[in-house]
């Protein structure tokens, strides 16, 4: 979707099957107000963008309402009447789901179940990443619904969690974007913490029976 086109770089993001954002970076036209013309059907006339994004006072993108549209976006970026770049793109290939909402944690001994509100459309993966200060990298688990149980946790350790949503590649293709991460939440002994200590605290000595 990027690629140089007469010096024009294009990026498309379909936010949560609600809004399409098309942005361009045209070095050759850096001081020019390029116009964006589009249609969602090959038979329609082009409409001009009514919601431009501006960068340094010049047009650099367009936001389009496109709620739950199973459509091709046909568009033309023009300098006056001269088309600078014309293309057609299947919008859902560029899906970016919204960040998980209402994230909740339910603890039971050495396991936690992370839940959140499922999005209104399917074929998504809900990914939970977690780590303790003892871990060198994030661990990950994902499920088809926002109900992810992680087992084998150490009740004495503090764990940081965050959650995101990804589109399934075999349904939406390889060019989608994962959602933004939810806020990091820290937990220890089933209770929420402000943060996990960067340097791990030494484990408490076990009392002999």
């Amino acid at each position: 979707q990027g690629g140089a086109a007469e010096g024009v770089q294009i990026q498309i993001i379909y936010f949560n099957l609600e809004t399409v954002q098309v942005t361009w970076n045209a070095s050759k036209y850096s001081r020019t107000n390029l116009t964006f013309h589009y249609r969602f059907n090959g038979d329609e006339a082009y409409d001009q963008c009514t919601n431009y994004l501006l960068q340094e006072g010049h047009t650099s993108g367009c936001l389009l309402d496109a709620e739950q549209r199973d459509d091709i976006l046909y568009f033309s970026i023009r300098n006056g009447t001269h088309p600078v770049f014309t293309a057609s793109r299947w919008m859902v290939y560029y899906l970016k789901p919204s960040s998980p909402k209402h994230v909740r944690f339910s603890w039971h001994q050495d396991a936690v179940t992370v839940t959140c509100s499922d999005l209104s459309y399917g074929d998504l993966l809900y990914e939970v990443q977690y780590r303790s200060p003892f871990d060198t990298e994030w661990q990950s688990k994902q499920e088809n619904t926002c109900n992810v149980t992680i087992e084998g946790l150490d009740a004495e350790k503090c764990y940081s969690f965050w959650v995101r949503v990804k589109a399934m590649e075999d349904v939406y293709g390889p060019d989608t974007y994962p959602s933004d991460w939810s806020e990091v939440t820290c937990w220890q002994r089933g209770e929420i913490r402000d943060a996990c200590a960067e340097t791990p605290t030494p484990p408490k000595p076990k009392l002999s029976k």
Partner: antibody, heavy 118, light 106 residues
């Protein structure tokens, strides 16, 4: 391994409608691929006719658009082409193919010759 | 519509030669271009997609380059199996094929 197989009449009368079906096996027609039709008149080059997504959205060659109908039947794992008001110029080998994401036509049927003649 | 012009129409070469086929788009297509090989009586075979990505299973002697309006397919050392007709295809806006380049034995 995805396989595609075209089927339909090999002879169509002028002004009639050409109808072809492409059966998809070895992969899901409901994947994120597009399903395409391409034709090749005898001794000539390739011409893109159009394509369809499993949800029914189509993207057709503007020069043929008014005559072309592409449809999909997910339950039968097949997609179809109808080309109306045919003339001798529509005589060609017709291929169905899979358009993988944004990466070209990676699987093709073996092609079927359709002759338009009275 | 976007027109694709291939050159040359016919190319005579020998086994071991390095050959280049050019494809020019009538307007910018970014890198949304594929190359195909077709042999008589057979369906086309995908060689290169996104202008320069080699399709799985295709020998590395095939390579593609270019962006915008100018693209090339290069075969670094021709093999007997490479004599065929080659087509470029843009899929940036609708889709269009070039008219083909027939690669024949000199």
């Amino acid at each position: 391994q995805v396989q595609l197989q075209e089927s339909g009449p090999g002879l169509v009368k002028p002004s009639g409608t050409l109808s072809l079906t492409c059966a998809v096996s070895g992969g899901s027609i409901s994947s994120s691929n597009w399903w395409s039709w391409v034709r090749q008149p005898p001794g000539k080059g390739l011409e893109w006719i159009g394509e369809i997504y499993h949800g029914g959205t189509t993207n057709n060659n503007p020069s043929l658009k008014s005559r072309v109908t592409i449809s999909v039947d997910k339950s039968k794992s097949q997609f179809s082409l109808k080309l109306s008001s045919v003339t001798a110029a529509d005589t060609a080998v017709y291929y169905c193919a899979r358009h993988r994401y944004s990466n070209g036509l990676d699987y093709w049927g073996q092609g079927t010759l359709v002759t338009v003649s009275s | 519509d976007i027109q694709m012009t291939q050159s040359p129409s016919t190319l005579s070469a020998s086994v071991g030669d390095r050959v280049t086929i050019t494809c020019r788009a009538s307007q910018s297509i970014s890198n949304w271009l594929a190359w195909y090989q077709q042999k008589p009586g057979k369906a086309p075979k995908l060689l290169i997609y996104k202008a320069s990505s080699l399709e799985s299973g295709v020998p590395s002697r095939f390579s593609g380059s270019g962006s915008g309006t100018e693209f090339t397919l290069t075969i670094s050392s021709l093999q007997p199996d490479d004599f065929a007709t080659y087509y470029c295809q843009q899929y940036n806006h609708y889709s269009t094929f070039g008219q083909g380049t027939k690669l024949e034995i000199k």
